[in-house]
């Protein structure tokens, strides 16, 4: 999916008001300095691409993020503010239902959500001019 035509300001507002709170809850008890950010993004569409990938694609050691509250709110925000996004997700959602696993917060998941934190942080920054 190409995130270029999303309403970034609306997604930013959704992140600040709700998604961030769920990330805070998920990460509670974890030091912000515990994990280094290894995933970065260069502009808002790129940030959303990386956010979608980390939130909804199961990875080794962390298969369960898509069922977390922050993931469901992320999905809702993208569905509302990115034209045509929901249609592209129907097949992915059906595949995910078949793979559904018990929710377990592993260290790998905490690390992955820490990466998400960094991506959202970068998404939030207004445009910075390169020197």
């Amino acid at each position: 999916y190409d995130f270029t035509n999303c309403d970034f300001e609306k997604i930013k507002a959704a992140y600040l008001s709700t998604i961030s709170k769920d990330l805070i809850t998920y990460m509670s008890g974890t030091k912000s300095t515990e994990f280094n950010n290894t995933v970065s993004c260069s502009n808002r569409p790129h940030c959303l691409t990386e956010i979608q990938s980390l939130t909804f694609n199961p990875t080794a050691g962390c298969a369960s993020l898509a069922k977390e509250m922050f993931a469901m709110k992320t999905k809702a925000a993208l569905a509302i503010w990115c034209p045509g996004y929901s249609e592209t997700q129907i097949n992915a959602t059906q595949a995910m239902k078949k793979r559904r696993k018990r929710k377990v917060t592993t260290n790998k998941c905490l690390e992955q959500v820490s990466q998400l934190q960094g991506l959202w942080r970068r998404f939030n920054r207004p445009l910075l001019k390169q020197q």
Epitope: L16, L23, T33, N37, R121, P126, K129
Partner: antibody
Framework: QVQLQQSGAELVRPGASVKLSCKAS????????MHWVKQTLVHGLEWVGT????????AYTQKFQGKATLTADVSSSTAYVELRSLTSEDSAVYYC????????????WGQGTTLSVSS | DIVMTQSQKFMSTSEGDRVSITCKAS??????VAWYQQKPGQSPKTLIF???NRHTGVPDRFTGSGSGTDFTLTISNVQSEDLADYFC?????????FGGGTKLEIK
């Protein structure tokens, strides 16, 4: 733990330039933007600008465009603000402050550097 | 630029009281507001971020609320160590802008 250590007080002549530093420790320097804030009795707290240490990208308040230049040295985890063509109006305490973990706020502050511009 | 107005420059309260400090934005800043405490001779300290989240180590007598244009910092059971200046800051849009500050005095 996160610490921002700023350089010492400066007394400089009008018309000169000065470069203030802010050494970060306790976190990965390139993961967080760094902001600079000016404080005076007259104007209170004013946001000067921000820098993304990873890319070198910057943004400034219009008032400080041309007055302040923000840079970052990743190798030493140090952020800098250079102030040029100094006047008494630039006399203030300057703070560096780190972008918050979740974005949309700043969390940790340096101890501040007092700049006095006087002939 | 977005203007952040703290209409009360000074507020006087007694130990044990509850006090509310307000901040009004000139346009919608959603929940991108933080509150800072500054004691004499010290650098500012983060109290509340994203309108209502307490920063690490901040006592739970400090509470933030609001969204859009109206924000409130409430201190319940005021202590003598709460004597300080309190500032709001919007981080929705560059340039980020601070409120003028409210000085809390303890009777």
């Amino acid at each position: 733990q996160v610490q921002l250590q700023q350089s010492g007080a400066e007394l400089v002549r009008p018309g000169a330039s000065v470069k203030l530093s802010c050494k970060a420790s306790g976190y990965t320097f390139t993961d967080y933007a760094m902001h600079w804030v000016k404080q005076t009795l007259v104007h209170g707290l004013e946001w000067v600008g921000t820098i993304d240490p990873e890319t070198g990208g910057t943004a400034y308040t219009q008032k400080f465009q041309g007055k302040a230049t923000l840079t970052a040295d990743v190798s030493s985890s140090t952020a800098y603000v250079e102030l040029r063509s100094l006047t008494s109006e630039d006399s203030a305490v300057y703070y560096c402050t780190r972008e918050g973990s979740y974005g949309g706020y700043v969390d940790y502050w340096g101890q501040g550097t007092t700049l006095s511009v006087s002939s | 630029d977005i203007v952040m107005t703290q209409s009360q420059k000074f507020m006087s309260t007694s130990e044990g009281d509850r006090v509310s400090i307000t901040c009004k934005a000139s346009q919608n800043v959603h929940t991108a507001v933080a509150w800072y405490q500054q004691k004499p001779g010290q650098s500012p300290k983060t109290l509340i971020f994203l309108a209502s989240n307490r920063h690490t180590g901040v006592p739970d007598r400090f509470t933030g609320s609001g969204s859009g244009t109206d924000f409130t910092l409430t201190i319940s059971n005021v202590q003598s160590e709460d004597l300080a200046d309190y500032f709001c800051l919007q981080l929705w849009n560059y340039p980020y802008t601070f409120g003028g500050g409210t000085k809390l005095e303890i009777k």
